[in-house]
């Protein structure tokens, strides 16, 4: 899978994590920090 950093318009897309652009899947993906979950790392689960 080809990945790159998200475009600058997606700054702030991931609330508690890093935004990655999955090129072949045509979508952004949030790699969440420890303790966070959700599509945009918006939920704290500890």
């Amino acid at each position: 899978v080809s990945i790159t950093k998200c475009n600058s318009d997606m700054n702030g897309y991931c609330l508690h994590g890093q935004c990655i652009y999955l090129v072949d899947m045509s979508q952004n993906y949030c790699r969440c920090e420890v303790g966070y979950t959700g599509v945009r790392c918006e939920h704290f689960y500890l």
Epitope: T4, N7, S8, D9, Y13, L15, N28, V39, R40
Partner: antibody
């Protein structure tokens, strides 16, 4: 199956306002950004602005600033675009577009006609 | 706002011809460009995103290339069903469409 279903065609008088809705199904709008694009008859595509329903922030194209308002109701999974002080040049098809989790998934479009 | 200058605005070519459309951005858009095809009365259809990534179901005669501020969209062998208007879209910093290119058959 993911869908963006927009409200029906509108006819408005110059100076009036119009509010177009965009109801999402199959996904949560809080996971996305909702963009709005318009296309006047025989003209090109024009980006108007976008809403982040989770954070609640909005960005607009400069030319529409002060005249367009993009909102979202996360309880009904619906986004809205309101354009005020309508003029004949605002006659166009207005599209909502989902981005973020999936690159640019479009609604079917809503024709807004401004005529006296 | 980033400006996108698309050229030509229209072109006429024969079936089987190679067709090239260019888009120039007013600043580096880091390969964040998409290409759409629009036929009359229809919503735009995404063909390519991130400069060169073809969407599922899109014929391989369509391709894209470029970097920095200069990008190219190519139809390697024009087919009758390719008659449409094509738009570039930068999505690096907010969004801006190019002015469109109407492709016709000679």
């Amino acid at each position: 199956q993911d869908q963006l279903v927009q409200s029906g065609a509108e006819v408005k008088k110059p100076g009036a306002s119009v509010k177009v809705s965009c109801k999402a199904s199959g996904f949560n709008i809080k996971d996305t950004y909702i963009q709005w694009v318009r296309q006047a008859p025989g003209q090109g595509l024009e980006w108007m602005g976008r809403r982040d329903p989770l954070r609640g922030n909005t960005k607009y194209r400069e030319k529409f600033e002060g005249r367009v308002t993009i909102t979202a109701d996360t309880s009904t999974n619906t986004a809205y675009m309101e354009l005020s002080s309508l003029r004949s040049e605002d006659t166009a098809v207005y599209y909502c577009v989902r981005s973020g989790t999936l690159f640019d998934f479009w609604g079917q479009g809503t024709l807004v006609t401004v005529s006296s | 706002d980033i400006q996108m200058t698309q050229s030509p605005s229209s072109l006429s070519a024969s079936v089987g011809d190679r067709v090239t459309i260019t888009c120039k951005a007013s600043q580096d858009i880091h390969k964040y460009i998409a290409w759409y095809q629009q036929k009359p009365g229809q919503a735009p259809r995404l063909l390519i995103q991130y400069t060169s990534t073809l969407q599922p179901g899109v014929p391989s005669r369509f391709s894209g290339s470029g970097s920095g501020t200069d990008y190219t969209f190519t139809i390697s062998s024009l087919q009758p069903e390719d008659i449409a208007t094509y738009y570039c879209l930068q999505y690096d910093n907010l969004r801006t469409f190019g002015g469109g290119t109407k492709v016709e058959i000679k």
